[in-house]
C-alpha cells in the first residue's frame, strides 16, 4: 500500500527523501517469519526480547524464555530442542564469510530454569544444531565434528583430522560456502536423528589468496584463504555418515560417488535425507553441465551405504549449465522414492517435474512460458510452489497450490488476488504438514506478513503490517515506479523505471542505470524499497532504470543461457540497447547519463563505460570483477568453462576490463573497492587501476581499508555520500 498522493495545498507539507533518511534506515521494513515448532505452534522473539510460544489453535501464547535469561549471557539467537527440554543460547557472534560465523553457546534447561553445568561446550563453536528428534547435539569445533547424546553429557569426537585452512569437517570451505552450498554448515541429521551425514573438504592443494588486514597494530596481519580461482586446483570432497546411536561401533562410513562423476573433477552439491535409512546426494561434474542425483540405502548387514546405479538420475544441459544458479534440490513424496524437482522442460522453461523411476519418464507438473521458482512443501494431497506465471510479469512471485491427491491435479493461486496492488512478490513459510503457513509479501507496496490456514487458505491474522512505516511515509514524496518491457530483436528486456515525484514527460532528466546483470539474477522485481536510488529520484530529480538483459533468470533458457561461455558481452549490449530506447522516450537528457553497479554489476558498468558508445558521461564500479581469471572456480567455470587453450581461454582474455583501459579516456570513472574483500579480491580493482595508469587515463578511486565485499558499517555512509557527490558533479546538480 503506497501512501496516497496528495495534491495542491497539502503538497507543501510533503518532503523529499534525504540521503540521511537512507543511511539511517528510517524507512526500513519488518517481516515476520514464524519459528515453527509443530503443526500449530511457533516461537517468536517479542519486542522486549522474551521468547514467546504461540498456539494458533488455542489462540494462546506464553513466554518460554525470559529476556532476563537471554540478557544474562548476551544472547542474540536461540534454538529450542525438538523435545522442548532445552534451548541453546547463542552469543559472541563473530562473522566470518557470507554465511559463516563463530559463537559461544550456552544450554538452558527449561524444566529446571537453569543453565546446564558440567561438560560445557567449547568456544568458539563454528556450527551447532539439535537433532530433529530429542535433544542430541552436533557441533563443529576447530574443524572437527562432535556429538552429545544429551546436553550435559561428555562429547563424542567424530572426526580427528580437522585443520585450519586444510581439512574442514561439517562446515564448508570458502568456495563451497559461497558458491555451492550457500550455508555455514555441511552436516545433515537424518529425519529421526539416527544418522548424521557430513562433508569433509580437503583444501590441502588449493592455492591461497593472501591480503593484508591493517587493523590497529604496528604490523598488518595477513589473511590467508584457500580460494580456487578459475582453472585452479579445487577442494576434494567426501561424504560420510555415522550412526549416532552407536557412534563408536563402526565409525563414519563413506558414501560412494557415482562412477560417471568420479571419473574426473567433481563437486558435491547437496544432501537430502528421505528416511532414516535412505539418503539422496547430488553431484556435479567440474564442467557443470552434468548433474547426478544418487539415492542411497543403508545396508544393515554391512553397516554401509549402497547407491545402486538404478537409483542414479542424470540431469544434463545441452545449451548451458545444469540448473539455474544452483542445481535444484528434490522434494520427496510420501512413498520415499519418487520426488518433485524443478528443471528445464523441452521448451526451455524451468518447471516442476515428478520423477518416479527415471528422469526420461518424468511427468511434467507445471508448464507454460513462465517459470516455477521454488517448491515449498509437498503433503499427502498438496504441492505448494512459487512461480512468476500471473499476468506474465517475470518479476513477480505468487504462491500456488496443486492438488496431487486428485486427478487431474487442480491448480489454485493462493496469493494472486489477496492484496493485488500492494502484494505481488511473496514467499511462504509452512508449519509441519502444512497445517498453517505464513505469507510474507515484499511489495510493491509496504510489506505485510500474514498467517493462513493450510487447508482453506483463509487468513487468520496479520503478523506484521509495518504500520509505523506507513505513517512515516505519509509526508514523504516518494518516486513513482513503473515496470515495463522493451521488445528488441526478439529479446524481451524488462525494466524498472524510478521517476521523480513531479515527473513531467515534456522535461529532460538525467538518467542513472543501476546494473547487476549476473547470470541467473533478476533486478526487475515487484518489491518495496526505499533506498539510495529512491533518494536520487525523490530529492535529486534523477530517473533511475534497472534492466534485465540476456543472462538473467526466470524467463526461460534462451535468455538465461545466452551468455554461456561469453560473459561480458550480451549483458553489456542489452544495457546499452535499453539506454538508447530510453533516450527515444524523449524525457532523458542524453548528455547526462550514468551507470553504476556493484560486484558483477561493477564489471558490467565498467564494460559499458568502456564500450566506446559515447552514451555514458560517467559511471561507478563498486568491488568489480575485472578478469574472470581472478574469480572463484565454482562460479566462473559454471558460466565460462575453463581458462585453458583447448577450452575458453580466449574469451577469458577478451572479456577483461583491463583490455579496454584506453576506452575510459572519455568518461568519468569512479572505482571503489574494500581492501579486505574475501570474495571479489582487491586485486581486481588494483589491476584496473594499473591498466588505467599505464594507459595514462585519469580516473577517480576510493578504497575502504579492512572492508569486505559488503562495505558495511561506517563505510556504507561514506560510500553513498561519496557516490552522491560524484553523480551530482557529473550531472551538474548543485549541492
Amino acid at each position: 500500500l503506497r501512501p496516497s498522493r496528495v495534491h495542491n495545498s497539502e503538497e507543501n507539507t510533503m518532503r523529499a527523501l534525504t540521503l540521511k533518511d537512507i543511511l539511517n534506515g528510517t524507512f526500513s521494513y519488518k517481516t515476520f517469519f514464524p519459528n515453527w515448532i509443530s503443526g500449530q505452534e511457533y516461537l517468536h522473539q517479542s519486542a522486549d526480547n522474551n521468547i514467546v510460544l504461540y498456539n494458533i489453535e488455542t489462540g494462546q501464547s506464553y513466554t518460554i524464555l525470559s529476556n532476563r535469561t537471554m540478557k544474562s549471557v548476551n544472547a542474540s539467537n536461540y534454538g529450542l530442542s525438538p523435545d522442548r527440554q532445552f534451548v541453546y543460547l547463542e552469543s559472541d557472534y563473530s562473522k566470518l564469510w557470507r554465511y559463516s560465523y563463530t559463537a559461544t553457546y550456552y544450554i538452558y534447561d527449561l524444566s529446571n530454569g537453569e543453565f546446564v553445568r558440567g561438560n560445557e561446550l567449547p568456544r568458539p563453536i563454528q556450527y551447532l544444531c539439535w537433532s530433529p528428534v530429542g535433544s542430541k547435539l552436533a557441533y563443529v569445533y576447530q574443524n572437527n565434528i562432535y556429538l552429545k547424546q544429551r546436553p550435559g553429557d561428555p562429547p563424542f569426537q567424530i572426526t580427528f583430522n580437522g585443520r585450519e585452512n586444510k581439512i574442514f569437517n561439517g562446515i564448508p570451505d570458502w568456495v563451497y560456502e559461497e558458491e555451492m552450498l550457500a550455508t555455514k554448515y555441511a552436516l545433515w541429521w537424518s529425519p529421526n536423528g539416527k544418522f548424521l551425514a557430513y562433508a569433509e573438504f580437503n583444501d590441502t592443494d588449493i592455492p591461497v589468496i593472501a591480503y593484508s588486514y591493517y587493523g590497529d597494530e604496528q604490523y598488518p596481519r595477513t589473511i590467508n584463504i584457500p580460494y580456487p580461482k578459475a582453472g585452479a586446483k579445487n577442494p576434494v570432497v567426501r561424504i560420510f555418515i555415522i550412526d549416532t546411536t552407536y557412534p563408536a561401533y563402526v565409525g563414519p562410513q563413506e558414501v560412494p560417488v557415482p562412477a560417471m562423476i568420479a571419473s574426473s573433477d567433481y563437486y558435491f552439491s547437496w544432501l537430502t535425507w528421505v528416511t532414516d535409512e535412505r539418503v539422496c546426494l547430488q553431484w556435479l561434474k567440474r564442467v557443470q553441465n552434468v548433474s547426478v542425483l544418487s539415492i542411497c540405502d543403508f545396508r544393515e548387514d554391512w553397516q554401509t551405504w549402497d547407491c545402486p546405479k538404478t537409483q542414479e538420475h542424470i540431469e544434463e544441459s545441452r545449451t548451458g549449465w545444469a540448473g539455474g544458479f544452483f542445481v535444484s534440490t528434490p522434494v520427496f513424496s510420501y512413498d520415499a522414492i519418487s520426488y518433485y524437482k524443478i528443471f528445464s522442460d523441452k521448451d526451455g522453461y524451468k518447471h516442476i517435474h515428478y520423477i518416479k523411476d527415471t528422469v526420461e519418464n518424468a511427468i511434467q507438473i507445471t508448464s507454460g512460458k513462465w517459470e516455477a521458482i521454488n517448491i515449498f512443501r509437498v503433503t499427502q494431497d498438496s504441492l505448494f510452489y512459487s512461480s512468476n506465471e500471473f499476468e506474465e510479469y517475470p518479476g513477480r512471485r505468487n504462491i500456488y497450490r496443486i492438488s496431487i491427491g486428485s486427478y487431474p491435479p487442480s491448480k489454485k493461486c493462493v496469493t494472486c488476488h489477496l492484496r493485488k496492488e500492494r502484494c505481488q512478490y511473496y514467499t511462504a513459510s509452512f508449519s509441519d504438514y502444512a497445517k498453517y503457513y505464513a505469507l510474507v509479501c515484499y511489495g510493491p507496496g509496504i510489506p505485510i506478513s500474514t498467517l493462513h490456514d493450510g487447508r482453506t487458505d483463509q487468513e487468520i491474522k496479520i503478523l506484521e503490517e509495518n504500520k509505523e512505516l506507513e505513517n512515516a511515509l505519509k509526508n514523504i514524496q516518494l518516486p513513482k515506479e513503473e515496470i515495463k518491457k522493451l521488445e528488441v530483436d526478439e529479446i524481451t528486456l524488462w525494466y524498472k523505471m524510478i521517476l521523480p515525484p513531479q515527473f513531467d514527460r515534456s522535461k529532460k532528466y538525467p538518467l542513472l542505470i543501476q546494473v547487476y546483470g549476473g547470470p541467473c539474477s533478476q533486478s526487475v522485481r515487484s518489491v518495496f524499497a526505499v533506498n539510495w536510488i529512491s533518494y536520487l529520484a525523490s530529492k535529486e530529480g534523477m530517473v533511475i532504470a534497472l534492466v534485465d538483459g540476456r543472462g538473467t533468470a526466470f524467463q526461460g533458457d534462451k535468455l538465461l543461457y545466452a551468455v554461456y561461455r561469453k560473459l561480458g558481452v550480451y549483458e553489456v549490449e542489452d544495457q546499452i540497447t535499453a539506454v538508447r530506447k530510453f533516450i527515444e522516450m524523449g524525457f532523458i537528457d542524453e548528455k547526462r547519463i550514468a551507470i553504476w553497479g556493484w560486484s558483477y554489476g561493477g564489471y558490467v558498468s565498467s564494460l559499458a563505460l568502456a564500450s566506446g558508445t559515447g552514451l555514458f558521461k560517467c559511471g561507478i564500479a563498486v568491488a568489480p570483477v575485472s578478469s574472470w581469471e581472478y574469480y572463484a572456480s565454482v562460479y566462473t567455470e559454471r558460466f565460462m568453462g575453463l581458462p585453458t587453450k583447448d577450452d575458453n581461454l580466449e574469451h577469458y582474455k577478451n572479456s577483461t576490463v583491463m583490455a579496454r583501459a584506453e576506452y575510459f579516456r572519455n568518461v568519468d570513472y569512479l572505482l571503489i573497492h574494500g581492501t579486505a574483500d574475501d570474495n571479489v579480491h582487491f586485486q581486481n580493482s588494483a589491476q584496473i587501476a594499473k591498466a588505467l595508469v599505464n594507459a595514462q587515463v585519469d580516473f577517480q578511486a576510493m578504497w575502504y581499508s579492512d572492508q569486505n565485499h559488503g562495505l558495511s558499517g561506517l563505510s556504507t555512509n561514506h560510500l553513498y555520500t561519496h557516490m552522491t557527490h560524484f553523480l551530482k558533479q557529473c550531472f551538474s546538480l548543485s549541492d
Epitope: 509443530s38 503443526g39 500449530q40 505452534e41 522474551n50 510460544l53 498456539n55 489453535e57 488455542t58 489462540g59 494462546q60 506464553y62 513466554t63 518460554i64 524464555l65 525470559s66 529450542l80 522442548r84 527440554q85 527449561l110 524444566s111 530454569g113 497445517k435
Partner: nanobody, 119 residues
Framework: QVQLQESGGGLVQAGGSLRLSCTAS????????MAWYRQAPGKRRELVAG???????NYVDSVKGRFTISRDNAKNTVYLQMNSLRPEDTAVYYC?????????????WGQGTQVTVSS
C-alpha cells in the same frame, strides 16, 4: 491466573500401576501442548512425557512402552498412565505446559504429586 493441580500419586509396589491426573483451571485451554515432569530426590527435574496440540506424543527413553500420556480437552485434563513401575520412577511428578511456562500469572510449578515405588 491459571492453576495446575496434579493428583493420583501414591505408594505402589514395583511392577504396579498408577494413573496421574492434571487439571487446569482459569482461562487456559487444555489443547495446548502439555507434559509430565518429575524430580527425584537430589536430582534435577526432567521431562517424562509430552503431548502436543495434535495429540502426538513424546517419551523419554526410560519410560517408553510403560507410560502413556493422554488428554481430555473437554475436561482440561492431562493424564499419565504408569505401568510396570520401577523403584527408579520414584519422584514428585508435575505437569506443566510443554515447554514449561514462565512469567506472570503462570510462573511457578504446582505442588506436584508424590509417586513412591517400593521394591
Amino acid at each position: 491466573q491459571v492453576q495446575l493441580q496434579e493428583s493420583g500419586g501414591g505408594l505402589v509396589q514395583a511392577g504396579g500401576s498408577l494413573r496421574l491426573s492434571c487439571t487446569a483451571s482459569g482461562t487456559f485451554s487444555g489443547r495446548n501442548a502439555m507434559a509430565w515432569y518429575r524430580q527425584a530426590p537430589g536430582k534435577r527435574r526432567e521431562l517424562v512425557a509430552g503431548i502436543r496440540s495434535d495429540d502426538s506424543t513424546n517419551y523419554v527413553d526410560s519410560v517408553k512402552g510403560r507410560f502413556t500420556i493422554s488428554r481430555d480437552n473437554a475436561k482440561n485434563t492431562v493424564y499419565l498412565q504408569m505401568n510396570s513401575l520401577r523403584p527408579e520412577d520414584t519422584a514428585v511428578y508435575y505437569c506443566n505446559l510443554w515447554p514449561p511456562v514462565i512469567g506472570a500469572g503462570f510462573g511457578s510449578w504446582g505442588q506436584g504429586t508424590q509417586v513412591t515405588v517400593s521394591s
